[in-house]
Interface confidence: medium
């Protein structure tokens, strides 16, 4: 085996490699140093480094190990990136066709209660929306004030219309009797069930997602400490102080530094792991009602089976409501 | 019973689709996530040595440097790091993570906890039947899962499941004009669908 | 190619402030980490500051620390230094350079400079 080159007897090697870092020649010896007050590239002879160069390299290497770290994690960022974007986005073309469908359910249908029922599904599916994206809403409130809105409606538009219907005072009373008298059957548990389920799963869905970029985020930024600093300076620049340019620090060495320098960032792997097969199992279970894609652009159909079950117990319910709410229609009719 | 949406909307005649071969809906495109996700499950135990490959490192030539002396690639020396009478690696190790990096894996730990709550094995949701409570029986079995269409056409099911890469562009009024009540009819409304979403790999 | 244009120089009064633009074009900006320079008359250039590729870190000469400030937007491809309570001197060219990629050939990029002289 032929032993190692001699270190540059001028410098001159070093010196100007070190002018591409570092502007200026001042802090490089110009003839090999005994190099006393280094304290990272600690000589066994003579050096071509100063303290200043130490400086300057430990600052490159941690420039270097942040850009590394930043283009490791690129792909899995733009992954996650695009896909929360993707998706927040398609979920609202779902909430926009859901709102569509139903407003079109009614128009054809019902067309007297269109202009209050599309007042009352555009501000049930923003609630959606908003749910979605994070707002503390109550689904089953939402769909509590869908049908406490449409029921005085249904009543003096389609089943009593000889009423006049701008009374609030017997709308009040409607509203309370919707509850009271599970006026649409079981329906409206029905659609807080469903909606509530695929809601929360969506919700939780977005909500991984916009953690895992955080998660990139954090650890493609981190400060790498002092003691890292020197590491990393000891072996991708202390060769360069005994004048071994092209020399490359061995593979097992470099191992050995990043498990050091990176021992923090590894202990993410368990809960990285964790995450991604959690987020799997959710995916898995994301169908039927745990989907909101199925349940939302079946809401029309639903909502329509509840107007018709109203129908269907017209003669009982007025009967009904006209005993309860028979104080407010007095008052209203003088 | 109700019409449907599609039936109203859709003249299956002028209906453009942009090039979909297979239905391509967002529970597809989540399973592909979840797979793509899946190549980069063990990205954090593999960074140190992503980090080695990715930056200069002795791999043909003979002699390398271990931190302290130019060695044979091969040695004992060269797996040693050269760090005697400096600062411990284990030390560094010991220090534990950032404080950044342990409110991230609070937060991991949080949603992981959300996550497995929310996938627990899914019984059925309502035991009772539509018809035990209100007026008079709806249509709808125990199971509601199975149940979204409710009743009146018996189990409707959503016939045109909205298309992940088509975005249903509707002509009707219904967004902006609430008073108007004219009757929608197929021919009136072309629906044109184009990849709205830019694929992701 | 490669292009960087200083500008914001000028004359000013101690104590006062000042803020140097960097321009750069040729290159994927976000994918460099960037430094500025300095260097008086008739002395040797000296390091100012660096930033990271995505701005997290930055680092500065340990005479200037507190009164420099270093920053980055990468949407607009340009390299800021805010330079504060000014002395006599800080007078110098001052030059931003692009800082080589780990691995890259060993010649680097400068701007063509812009003077910054303070004097009352």
């Known amino acids: 085996q032929p032993p190692p080159p001699p270190p540059d007897a001028t410098c001159h090697q070093v010196r100007s490699f070190f002018q591409r870092l570092q502007p200026g020649l001042k802090w490089v010896p110009e003839t090999p140093v005994p190099g006393s007050d280094l304290q990272v590239c600690l000589p066994k002879g003579p050096t071509c480094c100063s303290r200043k160069m130490e400086e300057k390299y430990q600052l490159t290497a941690r420039l270097n190990m942040e850009q590394l770290l930043q283009s490791a994690s690129m792909e899995l960022k733009f992954l996650i990136i695009q896909n929360a974007a993707v998706f927040q986005e398609a979920f609202e073309i779902v909430v926009r066709h859901a709102k569509n469908y139903t407003n079109a359910m009614f128009k054809n249908n019902y067309p007297s209660l269109t202009p209050q029922a599309f007042e009352f599904v555009g501000e049930f599916f923003t609630d959606v929306s908003l749910y979605i994206l994070g707002s503390d809403i109550n689904v089953d409130d939402m769909v509590n004030e869908l049908f406490d809105s449409l029921f005085p409606v249904i009543y003096t538009q389609l089943m009593n219309p000889g009423l006049p219907d701008s009374a609030l005072d017997i709308n009040e009373c409607l509203r309370g009797a919707r509850r009271d008298l599970k006026v649409f059957g079981n329906f409206p548990k029905l659609i807080m069930t469903q909606v509530s389920k695929s809601l929360q799963v969506t919700r939780i869905f977005l909500q991984a997602l916009n953690l895992g970029i955080e998660v990139i985020n954090t650890t493609d930024h981190l400060k790498f400490s002092k003691d890292c600093g020197r590491m990393l300076t000891r072996m991708w620049y202390c060769s360069y102080c005994q004048g071994l340019m092209m020399v490359k620090p061995c593979g097992g060495y470099c191992n050995v530094v990043m498990q050091g320098c990176m021992a923090g960032v590894v202990e993410i792997d368990k809960y990285w792991r964790e995450y991604i097969l959690s987020l799997e199992e959710l995916v898995n279970g994301m169908y039927r009602i745990y989907d909101m894609e199925n349940v939302l652009l079946g809401l029309f159909s639903t909502i329509h089976d509840s107007i018709q079950y109203v129908q269907k117990n017209a003669g009982k319910l007025t009967t009904t409501i006209g005993k309860l709410c028979a104080h407010s229609q007095q008052r209203q009719y003088r | 019973s109700a019409y449907y949406p599609e039936d109203l909307f859709i003249d299956k005649k002028v209906l453009k689709v942009a090039h979909v071969e297979h239905e391509e809906t967002l529970s597809s495109r989540r399973r592909e996530l979840i797979q793509k996700l899946k190549s980069f499950i063990s990205f954090y135990s593999a960074l140190p040595g992503y980090i080695c490959s990715h930056s200069p490192v002795a791999e043909n030539d003979t002699l390398c440097w271990n931190g302290q002396e130019l060695v044979e690639r091969y040695s004992q020396k060269a797996a040693r790091n050269g760090m005697k009478n400096q600062f411990n690696l284990h030390e560094l190790k010991m220090k534990g993570p950032e404080p950044v990096v342990s409110q991230i894996i609070d937060k991991l730990k949080h949603i992981n906890q959300l996550l497995r709550t929310m996938s627990m094995p899914k019984g059925r949701v309502l035991d009772k039947n539509l018809d035990e409570e209100g007026f008079e029986s709806g249509d709808c079995g125990d199971d509601e899962d199975e149940c979204i269409g409710g009743s009146g056409d018996g189990m409707i099911k959503v016939k045109n499941q909205l298309r992940f890469l088509a975005e249903l562009a509707y002509d009707l009024d219904v967004d902006d004009a609430p008073g108007n009540s004219q009757q929608a009819t197929p021919k009136d409304n072309e629906i044109s669908t184009f990849h709205n979403l830019g694929n992701v790999h | 190619q490669v292009q960087l244009v200083e500008s914001g120089g000028g004359v000013v009064q101690p104590g006062r402030s000042l803020r140097l633009s960097c321009a750069a074009s040729g290159f994927t900006f976000s994918s460099y980490a960037m430094s500025w320079v300095r260097q008086a008359p008739g002395k040797e250039p000296e390091w100012v500051s660096s930033?990271?590729?995505?701005?997290?870190?930055?680092y500065y000469a340990d005479s200037l620390k507190g009164r420099f400030t270093i920053s980055r937007d990468n949407s607009k491809n340009t390299l800021y230094l805010q330079m504060n309570s000014l002395r006599a001197e800080d007078t110098a060219v001052y030059y931003c350079?692009?800082?080589?990629?780990?691995?890259?050939?060993?010649?680097?990029?400068w701007g063509q400079g812009t003077l910054v002289t303070v004097s009352s």
């Open positions: 350079s692009r800082d080589p990629r780990f691995g890259e050939p060993p010649f680097d990029y």
């Open positions: 930033i990271s590729g995505g701005g997290s870190s930055t």
